[in-house]
Every structure is written in structure tokens, then in C-alpha cells.
């Protein structure tokens, strides 16, 4: 195609030299996922109020959810690279049983819930391909999954709605710190 | 695949204005991150600005105030909007497409800026 006025085109890169890093890519997609989490924390907070209730220590006990702990080796002060990376994956194995929760508690936003649940499985898959332990790595049993999303269908409206603001509220600081860590790997 | 054709660029005096648009093919526009990324000869590619899904906008350092970046979900384009142009801007511009449900990334051929008066 002809370049256009005031353009040089030898100095214009094909766009195969240009592809992103590993470590770009995670960014980017890790980025992605906060964008959507962001997206949908919107209509969770513009439906209930659950986001100024001081009642979220009740829900909370029903939830396990995948916190960033000092033995991690994910913070600044005991960073531990292969450690931490085992911590991120099985933590997002352990998220996706509740981001399959997710899915059907969103009106208006459904497709940015079925986006966030599909890119963090493709994070997980960039992750696996970057940890050299796998072996570290616990996949968590189908059939306890299950029975746990079985458990949070059955709650009433209310609980409902605070497992879903405590879900968000979590995986989104669990991938903030995430991406802090991976950041200095 | 997406494809992305990036235009807008040319040669303007330091203080000037110019446009860059990025339009992109195919039906997942709306859920695609668009980036702007620019490389000086001899130089790494950095990112100048992002603008996200929810339209979240994000601009590098030297040069917010100056850039400011757009999407229009309707016609499937991105923009980049460039004031104030100093030489230093002078690089090849990408737009990059990031489709995070596949982890896919997709780039222009690039759009050659110079700013010389």
C-alpha cells in the first residue's frame, strides 16, 4: 500500500517484530482482568449497598478466599520468586470456582463476567508456562468445588449479594498484589 | 484475527498538532485493550497510552497533558490525540490491539511521526 504523505516507509516495522514479552503479556493480562473486575464491582455497588456494609465478616466466614500471606514470599520484605509464583497459580485455581459463581449474578454486565472468568484462565496459563515447579502447584478437587458453588446458590439474596461483593473485593486485591510481585520477577 | 490499520502521522513543527487513528477489523472490538506504543531509532518501544475495555484511560509520564487517547466502540477505531508536539516525540507509533480472553496481542504496521521544524 502506498505510505502516506510525510511518512517514511522504511522506517515502519512489520508488525511480527513487535511482539510483547512474557512478562508484558501478564501484565497486560493481569491488567485486563482488573479492568473487568473494576467493571463489574460498578453494578454490584450501584445495585446494593453491600459496598458501605459493615456486615461483610458475616458473609465472610462462608468464604475461603485466597488470601496474599507474609510466608508467600510475595511482598517486598521475604520476596521469594518460585515460591510466590506457586502462591499466585494455586490462588487463581482456587478463585475460579468462584468466578464460576459469578457468572450468573450480573444483568447488565454478564458478558464482562464471562470475560473476566475466561482471561484469568488464560493468565493461569501464561503463569504455568512461566513456574519451573509445577509440581508445587495444587489443583483444587472438582467435587469439593461443586459442592461449594452448590453452597453459595443455596444462600438467600442477601448473602448472595455480599459473596458476590466480597469475591470481587478479594480477586482484585489478590491480582493487585500479584501483579506488585510479578513485577519484580 | 484482528487486523490494524494505523495512519495519521507525518512531519509537523515542534508546537503542532496531529491525530492518529487506528481502525480495526472484525466483530471484538468492545472487548479489546487498544494501546498506543511508540520506538525511536535506536531506542526501546515504550508504551505511550492505554485506554481499556471500560475505557479506563492511562498515559505515560512525559507526555500527559499533551496526549490524550479515545476509543469509539461504533466504529471500531482508536484514537491518539497529539498536542504540543516536541522532537523528542519524533518514533514510529503502534497501535496494539490485547484481547484478553485469548491473551492474543495484535499490532499496525506503524505510523512514522516526526516532529523538526
Known amino acids: 500500500a502506498p505510505v502516506p504523505p510525510g511518512e517514511d516507509s522504511k522506517d515502519v516495522a512489520a508488525p511480527h517484530r513487535q511482539p510483547l514479552t512474557s512478562s508484558e503479556r501478564i501484565d497486560k493480562q493481569i491488567r485486563y482482568i482488573l479492568d473487568g473486575i473494576s467493571a463489574l464491582r460498578k453494578e454490584t455497588c450501584n445495585k446494593s449497598n453491600m459496598c458501605e456494609s459493615s456486615k461483610e465478616a458475616l458473609a465472610e466466614n462462608n468464604l475461603n478466599l485466597p488470601k496474599m500471606a507474609e510466608k508467600d514470599g510475595c511482598f517486598q520484605s521475604g520476596f521469594n520468586e518460585e515460591t510466590c509464583l506457586v502462591k499466585i497459580i494455586t490462588g487463581l485455581l482456587e478463585f475460579e470456582v468462584y468466578l464460576e459463581y459469578l457468572q450468573n449474578r450480573f444483568e447488565s454486565s454478564e458478558e464482562q463476567a464471562r470475560a473476566v472468568q475466561m482471561s484469568t484462565k488464560v493468565l493461569i496459563q501464561f503463569l504455568q508456562k512461566k513456574a519451573k515447579n509445577l509440581d508445587a502447584i495444587t489443583t483444587p478437587d472438582p467435587t469439593t468445588n461443586a459442592s461449594l458453588l452448590t453452597k453459595l446458590q443455596a444462600q438467600n439474596q442477601w448473602l448472595q449479594d455480599m459473596t458476590t461483593h466480597l469475591i470481587l473485593r478479594s480477586f482484585k486485591e489478590f491480582l493487585q498484589s500479584s501483579l506488585r510481585a510479578l513485577r519484580q520477577m | 484475527a484482528v487486523q490494524l490499520v494505523d495512519s495519521g502521522g507525518g512531519l509537523v513543527q515542534p508546537g503542532g498538532s496531529l491525530r492518529l487513528s487506528c481502525a480495526a477489523s472484525?466483530?471484538?472490538?468492545?472487548?479489546?485493550?487498544m494501546d498506543w506504543y511508540r520506538q525511536a531509532p535506536g531506542k526501546q518501544r515504550e508504551l505511550v497510552a492505554s485506554i481499556a475495555v471500560s475505557g479506563t484511560t492511562m498515559l505515560d509520564d512525559s507526555v500527559k497533558g499533551r496526549f490524550t487517547i479515545s476509543r469509539d466502540n461504533a466504529e471500531n477505531t482508536v484514537y491518539l490525540q497529539m498536542n504540543s508536539l516536541k522532537p523528542e516525540d519524533t518514533a514510529v507509533y503502534y497501535c496494539m490491539a490485547f484481547d484478553g480472553y485469548t491473551g492474543s496481542d495484535y499490532w499496525g504496521r506503524g505510523t512514522q511521526v516526526t516532529v523538526s521544524s
Open positions: 472484525g466483530s471484538i472490538f468492545s472487548r479489546l485493550a
